[in-house]
Amino acid sequence: MNGRVDYLVTEEEINLTRGPSGLGFNIVGGTDQQYVSNDSGIYVSRIKENGAAALDGRLQEGDKILSVNGQDLKNLLHQDAVDLFRNAGYAVSLRVQHRLQVQNGPIGHRGEGDPSG
């Protein structure tokens, strides 16, 4: 019998300074590119080695980005979200949601569409 898997969801404000090669991460999601079923949110899909996000260390693959410089990312087309990041300036404030898998019982199983990495 599988153990139950719960998720600890936390939010964090992350302030990044744009580096020589930018912020250094990739995103998926948007109203036209849903990555998680019934969720058009924006998720971090890649942290680039030695980029600003990697050097800061707080942003993780699988994190959901809720806002950029106070601007909500709800109900945005994918490319509009990309453009928002690209035009966000030198100092970028990200409100992010971390989702940490917490296993209860002997065996854990990640549900379909779970973005956590």
């Epitope: 990739n26 995103i27 693959e61 994918h78 990309v82």
Partner: nanobody, 128 residues
């Protein structure tokens, strides 16, 4: 982190076929760009074929176009490389590679087009 395990390599005669498989674990497969690279004896590692996270964009090395096909099965967390009409010059260690897909939030450049973050141990393909 992502763990990648290749299989399907072996010894085959020229003109024959092999199908390489790469099983991925450690994070949701559906968000990963996947690639196959090869390292021939005495040469540097070269990209052979890539497929993006949505499966709608592929790339092939010129010398394998029309002979090799990359595909993915998200339900099985696996990427495949079907290799037909194999030639002795295809002899190499073949490596599976992965990286997070999606769009860079930075301006896109060709620099880094074939930069991958996670690598398998490789599987030997020998064409005699």
């Amino acid at each position: 982190h992502v763990q990648l395990v290749e299989s399907g390599g072996g010894l085959v005669q020229a003109g024959g076929s092999l199908r390489l498989s790469c099983a991925a674990s450690g994070r949701p497969f559906s968000s990963l760009d996947m690639g196959w690279f090869r390292q021939r004896p005495g040469k540097e590692r070269d990209v052979v074929a890539t497929i993006n996270w949505t499966g709608d964009s592929t790339y092939y090395l010129d010398s394998v176009k029309g002979r090799f096909t990359i595909s993915r099965d998200n339900a099985k967390n696996t990427v495949f490389l079907q290799m037909n009409s194999l030639k002795p010059e295809d002899t190499a260690v073949y490596y599976c590679a992965a990286r997070g897909g999606g769009s860079s939030v930075d301006s896109e450049y060709d620099v880094g087009k074939f930069e991958y973050d996670y690598w398998g141990q490789g599987t030997q393909v020998t064409v005699s």
